[in-house]
Structure formats: C-alpha cells, structure tokens
Amino acid sequence: LQDLCSNCPAGTFCDNNRSQICSPCPPNSFSSAGGQRTCDICRQCKGVFKTRKECSSTSNAECDCISGYHCLGAECSMCEQDCKQGQELTKKGCKDCCFGTFNDQKRGICRPWTNCSLDGKSVLVNGTKERDVVCGPSPADLSPGASSATPPAPAREPGHSPQ
C-alpha cells in the first residue's frame, strides 16, 4: 500500500482519519515540511516577547524582545534585560560600573579605562562610567619649549581598549 502521506505538502498534514487525505493545518498551527502527520502549534509571542514574524501555515512565528530587553538563546527563547550605559548586568541585576571602568553599551560588562601612560600619552578627557578616557599628547609634548612642529602620536586602533 503506497504511503500517500509523502505527497502532502508543507502547510498540510496527512489525516489518517480521512484515508490519508492532505488536510490544511488548523488555525494557529503549521507544518514546515511535507509528509507531516500532525501540524505543530504556533509559538505565541506574548508578555516580554513581541512578534517579529507572524505564524503561517508553513512556518512558525518568530519572536523578539520588547524594548528594554534583548534576545538570548536559540530563536530568541529568552529575554534578558538591558542595563543603562554606565552599568553592567550581573546575576543580581544591573549594577553601576566601578570607578576606573566604563560601559558605553546597554549590555556587556564594564571595561577598564584605557591607560594612556602605556602609550606615553596623557589624559586629555577624564573617563566616566559611560565613556573611556580620551588620550592626548604625551606630557613631554605639553612641556614649555617643546616643539609645536612635532606631529601627534597615531591614535589607538578602535576596539583595542584593554579587556
């Protein structure tokens, strides 16, 4: 006896109660591949989740996180809270960056300020909880009598602040 179920396309299921007729998936369900004997229940994006893509008869809904949260896990299975700039997310919630560290993102951890003196430079702009320090010319360049024709030292490459 030929299995007629293999002929059932995505968006349908093989209804054994009706002589293996291909029946459309009921509302709020889907089948993403052919030959399915059941349709899967659509994911519901509610609460802290919001719908990024509606469920169709052939594909599941896709969720995102509402404002103030970001996705974690496969297919945004979890929502983790954002913190403010100048904070980091710990196991016990958002905590301010300690002195000498900063975070300019809504997620991630606080990182140490750049140590300008390692590059032979001085601090031009002090760091804050939200911003790294800005390094300026070396102290020698700022001393009286220093040649103003000395070109400034090359800037740090972006993304190379110490971790």
Partner: nanobody
Framework: EVQLLESGGGLVQPGGSLRLSCAAS????????MTWVRQAPGKGLEWVSS????????YYADSVKGRFTISRDNSKNTLYLQMNSLRAEDTAVYYC?????????????????WGQGTTVTVSS
Amino acid sequence: EVQLLESGGGLVQPGGSLRLSCAASGFTFSNYAMTWVRQAPGKGLEWVSSISGSGDSTYYADSVKGRFTISRDNSKNTLYLQMNSLRAEDTAVYYCAKEGTGTTSDYYYNVDVWGQGTTVTVSS
C-alpha cells in the same frame, strides 16, 4: 556538540516540591560551573542558582535561598535543582546553562550555552 537537556518540570501545588535535572553532553562536565536561570511569564530572565565545577561552591538568589538546592553528579554529567516550598511566583520556564569556567560567583554572568528549558507551574 555541547548539549543541555532539562527535565522534571510540571504542575505542582503551592508548598509542593519538584526536582529538575539537566543532562549535559559534549564537554567535560566537571570542568565547568553550571547555572539555573528562569523566565516567568511576561518577565525577563532571572538568575536562580550557580554551582562550581567541583560542586564545592554554591550561590543562590535571595528569592530562592533556603528553599532551593543546587547540586551536581559529575559521574553522571547531570545538574540538579531541588525545589521545595514552591510558591506561585516560582512559576517559570527553568533553563540550565553552562558557564565559561570552572569557578562561579553570584556576580558575573559567564554563560556560553543554554538548554531548551523545562516549564514549572505552581498552582492550586
């Protein structure tokens, strides 16, 4: 491939108990700290408890301290969460997670792999 598979969730009455398990594979289980987190309906992720790779250090969120116990059996590559005196506010999807090192604390998240979750419903 690193995999974490939770089980043991279900419906329980307030005051009741449940024991969640998390079967780990694809990595040297005893070398890594493990963590339980949960997500209640309509809320964000909440840290529950963490345990070091050797099992000698454990940490708990204030909301579960004295009611939940985290443990591990490194010979079986399994993490556990014994939940007693359950309350309605413990209703959530519980996820087991692998941390990036063998040590842990109640401060930094250091999670690099998540399980799929198991649902715990506390209701009369």
